[in-house]
C-alpha cells in the first residue's frame, strides 16, 4: 500500500480497513467526520468496526480504502468478529449496533438502506452509513481458541461452531447474550486513547473463528500475544 493513500480524505459511509495497534486491519465504516472544534478528535474519523460493532477515532494514516485493500487485508484472521465483519461489509454495510442512537456530533446523513449487496462483483459496494453508534463495549482479553486435532478444528465455520464438550464452565448469560465467563479469563485492560468508553456492552462476536494465521506485521506479534486473539468487546463463543 503506498504512503500517499494514507493521506486520503474520507467521507461518511466510506468503507475502509481500519488499523488499531495490536489488531489486524479491520473492515470498518466511516461514521463521523473529524470535528475540528474538538481538539481530541481533530483530524480523526469516528470508525465503526464491522463484526464487533465497536467504534474508535482514527486518523487517516490508519485507514485504507476497502475496495483497494481487500485483497491485501481481507484474508481470514483468527480474531473473533473479523470474519463476520468481512460478511457485513460486503452484504450489510449499513448495519448499526443494537440500541443505536444518533450521535450529536457531525454524523452521517441518513439515507434509505440499499438492497443486499452481491458478495462478489463489480465494485461499488459502498453503502450509505446511517449515522454513528454510541454503543461501545469494553475491551476484554480472553483465551485464544485451542488448536485441536479433529478435522476442521481450525475452520470455525457456520454449522460447526459449538463444541461437543465444554472447554470451561460458563455462567448464565444475560438477556442480550454478553457472556460473563470465568473471572480469570476476562481481564480488562485500559482502553486505547481513541476508543470511547460507554456503559453499553458490545454486540456478541462472530460465530466463527477463522483459520488461525500469523499476524502480517511483525511489530504486532508481541502486542497481539499480550492482548490475545480477540477483537474489541468480543468473547469466545467456542466454549460450548
Amino acid at each position: 500500500m503506498s504512503r500517499s493513500n494514507r493521506q486520503k480524505e474520507y467521507k461518511c459511509g466510506d468503507l475502509v480497513f481500519a488499523k488499531m495497534k495490536g489488531y489486524p486491519h479491520w473492515p470498518a465504516r466511516i461514521d463521523e467526520m473529524p470535528e475540528a472544534a474538538v481538539k481530541s478528535t481533530a483530524n480523526k474519523y469516528q470508525v465503526f468496526f464491522f463484526g464487533t460493532h465497536e467504534t474508535a477515532f482514527l486518523g487517516p494514516k490508519d485507514l485504507f480504502p476497502y475496495e483497494e485493500s481487500k485483497e491485501k487485508f481481507g484474508k481470514p484472521n483468527k480474531r473473533k468478529g473479523f470474519s463476520e465483519g468481512l460478511w457485513e461489509i460486503e452484504n450489510n454495510p449499513t448495519v448499526k449496533a443494537s440500541g443505536y442512537q444518533s450521535s450529536q456530533k457531525k454524523s452521517c446523513v441518513e439515507e434509505p438502506e440499499p438492497e443486499p449487496e452481491a458478495a462478489e462483483g463489480d465494485g461499488d459496494k459502498k453503502g450509505n452509513a446511517e449515522g454513528s453508534s454510541d454503543e461501545e463495549g469494553k475491551l476484554v482479553i480472553d483465551e485464544p481458541a485451542k488448536e485441536k486435532n479433529e478435522k476442521g478444528a481450525l475452520k470455525r465455520r457456520a454449522g460447526d461452531l459449538l463444541e461437543d464438550s465444554p472447554k470451561r464452565p460458563k455462567e448464565a448469560e444475560n438477556p442480550e447474550g454478553e457472556e460473563k465467563e470465568a473471572a480469570t479469563l476476562e481481564v480488562e485492560r485500559p482502553l486505547p486513547m481513541e476508543v470511547e468508553k460507554n456503559s453499553t456492552p458490545s454486540e456478541p462476536g462472530s460465530g466463527r473463528g477463522p483459520p488461525q494465521e500469523e499476524e502480517e506485521e511483525e511489530d504486532e506479534e508481541e502486542e497481539a500475544t499480550k492482548e490475545d486473539a480477540e477483537a474489541p468487546g468480543i468473547r469466545d463463543h467456542e466454549s460450548l
Partner: antibody, heavy 120, light 104 residues
Framework: QITLKESGPTLVKPTQTLTLTCTFS??????????VAWIRQPPGKALEWLAT???????RYNPSLKSRLTITKDTSKNQVVLTMTNMDPVDTATYYC????????????WGQGTLVTVSS | DIQMTQSPSSLSASLGDRVTISCRAS??????LNWYQQKPGKAPKLLIY???RLHSGVPSRFSGSGSGTDYSLTISSLQPEDIATYYC????????FGQGTKLE
C-alpha cells in the same frame, strides 16, 4: 447480483433417485468462505436443512438423511448438485438451494425453489 | 441434534400490535440464531442474523434478542406486509429450523 436457481424433475417415482441442480451467478464457489446449501419444505410444513458444500469441498449432511444424500459442485459451471436416493412420497417437497458464508451468518440468498412430487 | 421449538405455532394479531415470537433450543446455542420470514409460495428471507443483527433492508420494527436456549423475534408495530410465517434457525451445530410460527 446474486441469483440461484434450482432445476430437476418435478415428478419422481418411489425408490428412484432424485438429482437436483442449483445453478448460481454473482459469486463463485472457488471463493474462500462461500458455501451452498440445500433446504427442503414439504407442503404446509417447516423448512428442513439437507446438506451444505463449502468452497473447499468440506461437506455437511443432515444426520437423519445422510445415507441418502450426496452433494457435489462443479465450480467451472457454477453449479451444485444434490442427489437423494430411495425417494419416498414423504420426500415430496419444495427444494431450495441457498448461498451461505462460513462467516457464521444466515442463508442470505435463496433460489425460488422447485417442487418435487414423489408418486407412483 | 439440536432441536428448535417455536411458540406459538400460529397467532392472530391486529395491525399496529406488538408481536413476539419465541424460539427455544434443546441446548445452549450461544446466540447462533437467525430468523427468516416466508410468504406463501416464496422462498424464505433472512431477517435477523446472530440473534439481534438486522439484515440489510429489513425494517427497524423487527428486532431479535435472547441468549442461551431462549430467543425471541419482536415486531414492534405490525404492518400488513408482515403477515407471513416466521422461522428461527440455529447454526451452531449443523443447521436446524424451528417448526414455524404463522402470523395471521
Amino acid at each position: 447480483q446474486i441469483t440461484l436457481k434450482e432445476s430437476g424433475p418435478t415428478l419422481v417415482k418411489p425408490t428412484q433417485t432424485l438429482t437436483l441442480t442449483c445453478t448460481f451467478s454473482g459469486f463463485s464457489l472457488s471463493t474462500s468462505g462461500i458455501g451452498v446449501a440445500w433446504i427442503r419444505q414439504p407442503p404446509g410444513k417447516a423448512l428442513e436443512w439437507l446438506a451444505t458444500i463449502w468452497w473447499d469441498d468440506d461437506n455437511r449432511y443432515n444426520p437423519s438423511l445422510k445415507s441418502r444424500l450426496t452433494i457435489t459442485k462443479d465450480t467451472s459451471k457454477n453449479q451444485v448438485v444434490l442427489t437423494m436416493t430411495n425417494m419416498d412420497p414423504v420426500d415430496t417437497a419444495t427444494y431450495y438451494c441457498a448461498q451461505i458464508y462460513d462467516y457464521a451468518v444466515g442463508f442470505a440468498y435463496w433460489g425460488q425453489g422447485t417442487l418435487v412430487t414423489v408418486s407412483s | 441434534d439440536i432441536q428448535m421449538t417455536q411458540s406459538p405455532s400460529s397467532l392472530s394479531a391486529s395491525l399496529g400490535d406488538r408481536v413476539t415470537i419465541s424460539c427455544r433450543a434443546s441446548q445452549d446455542i450461544s446466540n447462533y440464531l437467525n430468523w427468516y420470514q416466508q410468504k406463501p409460495g416464496k422462498a424464505p428471507k433472512l431477517l435477523i442474523y446472530y440473534t439481534s443483527r438486522l439484515h440489510s433492508g429489513v425494517p427497524s420494527r423487527f428486532s431479535g434478542s435472547g441468549s442461551g436456549t431462549d430467543y425471541s423475534l419482536t415486531i414492534s408495530s405490525l404492518q400488513p406486509e408482515d403477515i407471513a410465517t416466521y422461522y428461527c434457525q440455529q447454526y451452531g451445530k449443523l443447521w436446524t429450523f424451528g417448526q414455524g410460527t404463522k402470523l395471521e
